[in-house]
Interface confidence: low
């Protein structure tokens, strides 16, 4: 009796399953009790001897390329051996490499975590991923793994991490680079300082009081809100950073606490309150403000 080894599929792609079948064309295996064993080169595969004429291999890799055969043994200890079959495992070269960021869009707050995710649309086997900083290419890290994506993490982003990044994927067919991704580091506003500026030391009713609010740190644009007690007076924008001012024509109702808030979309910070009180100087006919 003759024995054949059939691999299905016969030309597998890396990562895909393969079924090996040990066939006896002129003998029904049910006619006699057989045990089967599958080999690659000189090594037995799977469970060794088994009553099943099939062996399922869950995933084939490039290194599984080789010469396979099977043996069948009867109860009478007669051993049949198949001819060798060459199985070539096909590797798919990496293609369509892309670099994405988490958070998306490449905008990240100072101190936050930034993840650079390198992905390939196709590619099999062990893929080496490499991350580079700057168009010139300072190598940051490399990882080799059997997956289509890999991550490089900056746990706490600093201002100096604002740069262009790219990644390269390679699985034996030459490196394939991604496009450049720009990282913008957004800096939250610091607590603003509110200054009250009047045309004279003792501001009087109808004087123009300037409320100047400034956050010393923070990515522009910065929106400043001005408050009297809990009431919004208005807002001013500082498109390029720096401070902003709000003018008030003074009346008696302007006594009380003033504060301002700076907001650049990364959370808001409120200033300490500045208290403005009316005082009536002895012998004076008009009210004056003191802060």
């Amino acid at each position: 009796a003759e024995l054949f080894l059939i691999a299905s599929p016969s030309h597998p792609t890396e990562g895909s399953p393969v079924t090996l079948t040990c066939k006896m064309p002129f003998l029904q295996s049910s006619d006699a009790q057989f045990q089967f064993c599958f080999f690659r080169d000189t090594r037995a595969l799977g469970p060794g001897w088994s009553s099943s004429p099939k062996l399922q291999i869950a995933a084939m890799w490039k290194e599984d390329t080789g010469s396979y055969w099977c043996e069948a043994q009867t109860m009478a200890s007669k051993v049949l051996r198949s001819r060798r079959s060459q199985i070539n495992v096909h590797r798919v070269p990496v293609a369509d490499v892309s670099l994405e960021t988490q958070p998306p869009g490449g905008q990240v707050m100072e101190g936050d975590r930034l993840v650079l995710i390198c992905s390939v649309a196709m590619g099999t086997g062990d893929i080496t991923f490499l991350w580079y900083k700057g168009a010139v290419g300072l190598n940051l890290q490399s990882k080799t793994q059997r997956s289509l994506t890999a991550e490089y993490e900056i746990p706490s982003v600093r201002e100096s991490d604002a740069e262009q990044y790219y990644c390269v994927a390679e699985n034996g067919y030459g490196p394939s680079p991604s496009g450049l991704v720009s990282i913008t580091v957004r800096i939250p506003v610091s607590r603003p300082i509110l200054m009250l500026r009047a045309p004279r030391a003792q501001a009087a009713v109808e004087d123009v009081l300037e409320l100047h609010c400034e956050a010393l740190r923070g990515s522009p644009p910065i929106l400043y809100w001005f408050y009297h007690e809990d009431i919004t007076l208005g807002s001013r924008s500082a498109p390029s950073g720096g401070g902003a001012s709000f003018n008030l024509s003074l009346t008696e109702e302007h006594s009380g606490n003033y504060s301002c808030e700076a907001n650049n979309g990364l959370g808001a910070q409120r200033s300490e309150a500045v208290t403005l009180n009316f005082t009536v100087p002895t012998g004076a006919r008009s009210n004056h403000l003191t802060s």
């Epitope: 009431i231 007076l233 024509s249 808030e261 907001n263 959370g267």
Partner: antibody, heavy 117, light 112 residues
């Protein structure tokens, strides 16, 4: 979209305390102050107090100063109001509400607190 | 505290007719520095949370039908529903935010 989701109804005995939560989503929690409003059964709306989630600073209606304590947890974008020494007149629906330039533009669904022996 | 007084307490209007309600504050709500009136109007339907309709006395909140309008300045304010719809049955509250917030007692709007 902006959402304020409050904790469920509570039944408490006189003298007990209750803590109502209000989880905010869909906006930057620290940008907007959060107010709490009481509505007794069949009655109108009464302001309890407010908190600035950014600084944690709070202010109260004089009437509720010894009754309510408002706090926030910035990490979970949640505001809380604790009512202490509960009495039958504290039975009401309590709302959290976000304030935008003074006006209360988004409201929670309300939490009914029933005080009964 | 600023006291807000609404009138009438209840109002019955036919569908498609105009509904007008008033709100009076014990102090002026007009803030001289920005010429804004610190007053809002809310609608509360049975079993629901209040909903902001109008702020700055006359600015309609996004998504609010244009049949709702607010007017007035200083201490006297009006909310008008130009053509009452069945879904407008509710209690309407005015609220000042010139100081720590206070609400009017509400005006109940029903269909005649």
């Amino acid at each position: 979209q902006v959402q304020l989701v409050q904790s469920g109804a509570e039944v408490k005995k006189p003298g007990a305390s209750v803590k109502v939560s209000c989880k905010a989503s869909g906006y930057t929690f620290t940008r907007y102050w959060m107010h709490w409003v009481k509505q007794a059964p069949g009655q109108g709306l009464e302001w309890i107090g407010r908190i600035d989630p950014n600084s944690g600073g709070s202010k109260y209606n004089e009437k509720f100063k010894s009754k309510a304590t408002i706090t926030v947890d910035k990490s979970t974008s949640t505001a809380y109001m604790e009512l202490s020494s509960l009495r039958s007149e504290d039975t009401a629906v309590y709302y959290c509400t976000r304030v935008n330039s003074g006006a209360m533009d988004y409201w929670g669904q309300g939490t009914l607190v029933t005080v009964s022996s | 505290d600023i006291v807000m007084t609404q009138s009438p307490d209840s109002l019955a209007v036919s569908l498609g007719e105009r509904a007008t309600m008033n709100c009076k504050s014990s102090q002026s709500l007009l803030y001289s520095s920005n010429q804004k009136n610190y007053l809002a109007w809310y609608q509360q339907k049975p079993g629901q949370s209040p909903k902001l309709l109008i702020y700055w006395a006359s600015t309609r909140e996004s998504g609010v039908p244009d049949r709702f309008s607010g007017s007035g300045s200083g201490t006297d304010f009006t909310l008008t529903i130009s053509s009452l719809q069945a879904e407008d049955v509710a209690i309407y509250y005015c609220q000042q935010y010139s100081n720590y917030p206070t609400f009017g007692q509400g005006t109940k709007v029903e269909i005649k």
